[in-house]
């Protein structure tokens, strides 16, 4: 057993039938001696008398809030939670795995820039009850600071007949230096507690793995005299780090129409124009991605040929 | 060319050679970023890499204040990978294909420790660590992990000389 | 299966014209740019131009501007090129080439062997 | 337009040899590049696009590296279906240019 926080203990159980289940020593917070009775949740049953309460903790019916009293007066509140483990694994039961870039991903993270500054996000079918705290820092034997705001609720979607939540987090480190190598990841633990079940979440990374640039800004297009071939142009998106001489981003530019399955043009640069043939009913579409490190491909920006 | 003494290296030259080897880096393993190195404790055996650091003034504002400083942190970088991509972890079992960029990378980084440092002048280079895996899935992962760190080292080398090229330049 | 039939090997003279044909089946032309490349013998390749038989816009290589003329049948999903003033310099194996993409070739015909005699 | 520049002309090897095509383009062309394959009276046949992109159905032995003006066709040991001329083109800027190509023969 341990402390997630004040009054609030984790105990850790193997999952399995007929398991023994953990023996916990509950003590009232209180100069009090005697007279000191124990009841469970909302139940007026007495389940014990003392300043401490001894259970065996089995099943989630073991788990929950018990409360020390004196005399029909509250003296102190223990919040027992369970963490599952089966067959040696923790249980993973209140988040979606993502799937992406491989199984078993439940956060999932990206950066816009190299600022230190990153949002992390998670999927659950779960709407009620469900609680998450978030903790970071760049290395794990001595850590770094990092702040995490508070996760919130980002997007609903139904898939199906189920409703799925997205929750996300950003977090900040704070003594980000955007030009170093970084030789430490960064740690992410995500505390998830849905009625009496904890569960705990981590990804580790390095910001350059992580990065997607915004897509480019101020896309424009300009014919070229007796010719069907037009220069599209465009600039870094604002977020990008700076200076751009220093943290220099490639692009792709993709004149294609409506269906995946039509002809396209495409090509690849490092400049912030691009000649390409125009088609009716085609737009051109440019990406970018960091141009000495092969993380993601920002989302596509596009403006319609005609 | 960076020689010890403070002169300018050949900003354009390095860009290129740069951003060559950051190609090559990707080409020699392209898959190892679909593979969570970090789960087979890394500790031991990249922890000993030259890593371009915060203090180390290769950041804009460090490369107009002093680019010397910088330019001899990616000399030392280049010269322990070149050591490396020629040790024993490479030229051992299981045996890399002749042609494979892992060859080319390794003259491109002697190459741009060259154009950096010319015969004569010698900066100290950093001792590499004796690590000599015994089984050839060792040396394979052992790789993957140098090769990792490689691809992030010259990343920022080839920020630092096209910023160079762009604005440090004669 | 994707393929392109082009027409057989031709013997012209000297100053004359001719027109390749290029036919496609498993596919339709409309959906694809077309493309003709020539090869002369013991030779590299030469991009000659590409058509978008969708809408009959063209693309030539400045060598070939005035030299060649690209043309496309969508109802007999057939793509021409007609070479004129022809001298010794055409002669040469003249590929068609499909592709959905505009800037590389995919499908290939099996080419034209055009021989220009004086 | 832009010059491409293969070496070697000629590549004279044994099967089951590696081997390593080069193509230098006059000017930097990001990754617009791409390798074919022409076997004796035969069309053309893409092997790779965009510098390393591999193509379906090409076997596995074939890859490509490089970006700006430096391309590598590599060929992981050689089989005698392997042997004729190989050709990169750029899809830069027009004219799309070939370079001149470079023949491997049998030793």
């Known amino acids: 057993i341990w402390e997630l926080k004040k009054d609030v203990y984790v105990v850790e159980l193997d999952w399995y039938p007929d398991a023994p289940g953990e023996m916990v020593v509950l003590t009232c917070d209180t100069p009090e001696e005697d007279g000191i009775t124990w009841t469970l949740d909302q139940s007026s049953e007495v389940l014990g008398s003392g300043k401490t309460l001894t259970i065996q903790v089995k099943e989630f019916g073991d788990a929950g809030q018990y409360t020390c009293h004196k005399g029909g007066e509250v003296l102190s509140h223990s919040l027992l939670l369970l963490h599952k483990k089966e067959d040696g694994i923790w249980s993973t039961d209140i988040l979606k795995d993502q799937k992406e870039p491989k199984n078993k991903t439940f956060l999932r993270c990206e950066a816009k820039n190299y600022s230190g500054r990153f949002t992390c996000w998670w999927l659950t079918t779960i709407s009620t009850d469900l609680t998450f705290s978030v903790k970071s820092s760049r290395g794990s034997s001595d850590p770094q600071g990092v702040t995490c705001g508070a996760a919130t609720l980002s997007a609903e979607r139904v898939r199906g007949d189920n409703k799925e939540y997205e929750y996300s987090v950003e977090c900040q480190e704070d003594s980000a230096c955007p030009a170093a190598e970084e030789s430490l990841p960064i740690e992410v633990m995500v505390d998830a507690v849905h009625k009496l079940k904890y569960e705990n979440y981590t990804s580790s990374f390095f910001i350059r793995d992580i990065i997607k640039p915004d897509p480019p800004k101020n896309l424009q297009l300009k014919p070229l005299k007796n010719s069907r071939q037009v220069e599209v142009s465009w600039e870094y998106p604002d977020t990008w780090s700076t200076p751009h001489s220093y943290f220099s981003l490639t692009f792709c530019v993709q004149v294609q129409g409506k269906s995946k399955r039509e002809k396209k043009d495409r090509v690849f640069t490092d400049k912030t124009s691009a000649t390409v043939i125009c088609r009716k009913n085609a737009s051109i579409s440019v990406r970018a991605q960091d141009r000495y490190y092969s993380s993601s491909w920002s989302e596509w920006a596009s403006v319609p040929c005609s | 060319r960076a020689v010890p003494g403070g002169s300018s290296p050949a900003w354009t030259q390095c860009q290129q050679l740069s951003q060559k080897l950051c190609t090559l880096a990707w080409s020699a393993h392209p898959l190892v970023g679909h593979m969570d190195l970090r789960e087979e404790g890394d500790e031991e055996t990249t922890n000993d890499v030259p890593h371009i650091q915060c203090g180390d003034g290769c950041d804009p504002q460090g490369l107009r204040d002093n680019s010397q400083f910088c330019l001899q942190r990616i000399h030392q970088g280049l010269i322990f990978y070149e050591k490396l991509l020629g040790s024993d972890i490479f030229t051992g079992e299981p045996s890399l294909l002749p042609d494979s960029p892992v060859g080319q990378l390794h003259a491109s980084l002697l190459g741009l420790s060259q154009l950096l440092q010319p015969e004569g002048h010698h900066w100290e280079t950093q001792q590499i660590p004796s690590l000599s895996p015994s089984q050839p899935w060792q040396r394979l992962l052992l790789r993957f992990k140098i090769l990792r760190s490689l691809q992030a080292f010259v990343a920022v080398a080839a920020r630092v000389f096209a910023h160079g090229a762009a604005t440090l330049s004669p | 299966e994707v393929q392109l039939q082009q027409s057989g090997a031709d013997l012209v003279r000297s100053g004359a014209s001719i027109k390749l044909s290029c036919t496609a089946s498993g596919f339709n032309i409309k959906d694809y740019y077309m493309h003709w490349v020539k090869q002369r013998p013991e030779q590299g390749l030469e991009w000659i131009g590409w058509i978008d038989p969708e809408n009959g816009d063209t693309e030539y290589a400045p060598k070939f501007q005035g030299k060649a003329t690209m043309t496309a049948d969508t109802s007999s999903n057939t793509a021409y090129l007609q070479l004129s003033s022809l001298t010794s310099e055409d002669t040469a194996v003249y590929y068609c080439n499909a592709h959905k993409e505009l800037r590389y070739f995919d499908v290939w015909g099996a080419g034209t062997t055009v021989t220009v005699s004086s | 337009d832009i010059v491409l520049t293969q070496s070697p002309a000629t590549l004279s090897v044994t099967p089951g040899d590696s081997v390593s095509l080069s193509c230098r383009a006059s000017q930097s062309i990001s990754i617009n590049l791409h390798w074919y394959q022409q076997k004796s009276h035969e069309s053309p046949r893409l092997l790779i696009k965009?510098?390393?992109q591999s193509i379906s159905g090409i076997p596995s032995r074939f890859s490509g590296y490089g970006s700006g003006t430096d391309f590598t066709l590599s060929i992981n040991s050689v089989e005698t279906e392997d042997f004729g001329r190989y050709f990169c083109?750029?899809?830069?800027?027009?004219?799309?240019?070939f370079g001149a190509g470079t023949k491997l023969e049998l030793k």
């Open positions: 965009f510098a390393s």
């Open positions: 083109q750029q899809s830069n800027s027009w004219p799309l240019t």
